[in-house]
Amino acid sequence: QNCSGPCRCPDEPAPRCPAGVSLVLDGCGCCRVCAKQLGELCTERDPCDPHKGLFCDFGSPANRKIGVCTAKDGAPCIFGGTVYRSGESFQSSCKYQCTCLDGAVGCMPLCSMDVRLPSPDCPFPRRVKLPGKCCEEWVCDEPKDQTVVGPALAAYRLEDTFGPDPTMIRANCLVQTTEWSACSKTCGMGISTRVTNDNASCRLEKQSRLCMVRPCEADLEENIKKGKKCIRTPKISKPIKFELSGCTSMKTYRAKFCGVCTDGRCCTPHRTTTLPVEFKCPDGEVMKKNMMFIKTCACHYNCPGDNDIFESLYYRKMYGDMA
């Protein structure tokens, strides 16, 4: 956004920001806005929280339109009331080993976090906490009513789930790439991030991509067939253009989205790929952003618990990214 014009703000008064989020002036020094937080999309008009040492990382200079809020190199992390230095590792609980990297906490699960899909020998998988054990384990529940028999089992399909890319050694560099995190939004345009050292300098860097698990305006429950409880990957009737902060994708996409369930299960991306998408902005500028495209979704009971940010992150992470 060009800052040379007169300042005019939205008609409503200054916004009320959530606890811990700063009320700041936009990048033009015009209007009061709630500062964007770590990992959120930012623009010149929607700045990152300066009180947390964040800046808007636009990536390549050609894309100075929309970026991701990133902590300055070497920024410490505040986690659970404790301050950790950048590069410091710590165990947050028996389930997670965490590392602070430039203001962001990244955690690897110490427990298996695989998504287990129904199969003929285990049609109703469920995770349970066993006494005396830290990690939850899979158990196979019996169906409540014995109606799934015979040909109906053909509806079950084993899906490949992939863990992190196998580590590689390349020119004295142990290449490691974490899984893509869950999309920051359950509907609409969000971002997904990962950490990798798969670069020429073997230096840890944060990568991000746009993601859309499902459109917000879609009323997906209406499409669930009679007698069914889920619609896993609903058919999108027409190709769509993606929108990002006033810019529109130059191409239309017949994208897949994840559906919904009516029985408490949640549907999340299972296999994804990352492709570049070009956006054209009202001022004619074109920018290229990487975006997640869904190949398959999985519906499961491992829905993220609101009280556990790590389960939220790792039960919903993206498996099998092809890019």
Partner: antibody, heavy 119, light 111 residues
Framework: EVQLVESGGGLVQPGGSLRLSCAAS????????MAWVRQAPGKGLEWVAN????????DLLASLKSRFTISRDNAKNSVYLQMNSLRAEDTAVYYC????????????WGAGTTVTVSS | VVMTQTPLSLPVSLGDQASISCRSS???????????LEWYLQKPGQSPQLLIY???NRDSGVPDRFSGSGSGTDFTLKISRVEAEDLGVYYC?????????FGQGTKLEIK
């Protein structure tokens, strides 16, 4: 009652300086932009400058930028116009105005203070 | 952006309708999509007062006999039934582009 009261005007020689003040009352000062608008004798209105909530952004009429400065002190509910190297053509009534920064511009005006530049 | 008002003087009888035109030298649509065209009245010996903002919105306390309309570069202020207290100089103003500019003023006076 919402009120703006200007002060600091007077007679000054060409090349001289003046500092106009505007004291605001009756509203939350830091929730509004403030502005200065002037009116030469027998002439129309001319926008001079405005300033954002905290004083971190100021916009001035390009022809006045090198000589005039707008500033504010939210603790004192006041806005100022520092005028240097004054010329005869700066002679005018200077109005302080509240700028909503949203739908409308100048929704409250002061009574004005007269600046006369003459030798 | 130059704002040109017509007429410069408008003699009216009390109770008549009055219409003032304001034309901008270029489109005054702000980059946010709004048109910041305003009308001010300066009564004799007084400070200006806001009447209309964003082309057609009356400021609080402004009688409904005042109405604003227009788009692009052509705008109009109408007073449906002129009253004695309406006399003075009317200015249009654009706040969409720098420098912010006023029209030269239209003097509404009794015939």
């Amino acid at each position: 009652e919402v009120q703006l009261v200007e002060s600091g005007g007077g007679l000054v020689q060409p090349g001289g300086s003046l500092r106009l003040s505007c004291a605001a009352s009756g509203f939350t000062f830091s929730d509004y932009y403030m502005a200065w608008v002037r009116q030469a004798p027998g002439k129309g209105l001319e926008w001079v400058a405005n300033i954002n909530y905290y004083g971190s952004r100021t916009d001035l009429l390009a022809s006045l930028k090198s000589r005039f400065t707008i500033s504010r002190d939210n603790a004192k509910n006041s806005v100022y116009l520092q005028m240097n190297s004054l010329r005869a053509e700066d002679t005018a009534v200077y109005y302080c105005a509240r700028d909503t920064s949203r739908g409308s511009y100048f929704d409250v005006w002061g009574a004005g203070t007269t600046v006369t530049v003459s030798s | 952006v130059v704002m040109t008002q017509t007429p410069l003087s408008l003699p009216v009888s009390l109770g008549d309708q009055a219409s003032i035109s304001c034309r901008s030298s270029q489109s005054i649509v702000h980059y946010n999509g709004n048109t910041y065209l305003e009308w001010y009245l300066q009564k004799p010996g007084q400070s200006p007062q806001l009447l209309i903002y964003k082309v057609s919105n009356r400021d609080s306390g402004v009688p409904d006999r005042f109405s604003g309309s227009g788009s692009g570069t052509d705008f109009t202020l109408k007073i449906s039934r002129v009253e004695a207290e309406d006399l003075g100089v009317y200015y249009c103003f654009q706040g969409s582009h720098f420098p912010l500019t006023f029209g030269q003023g239209t003097k509404l006076e009794i015939k």
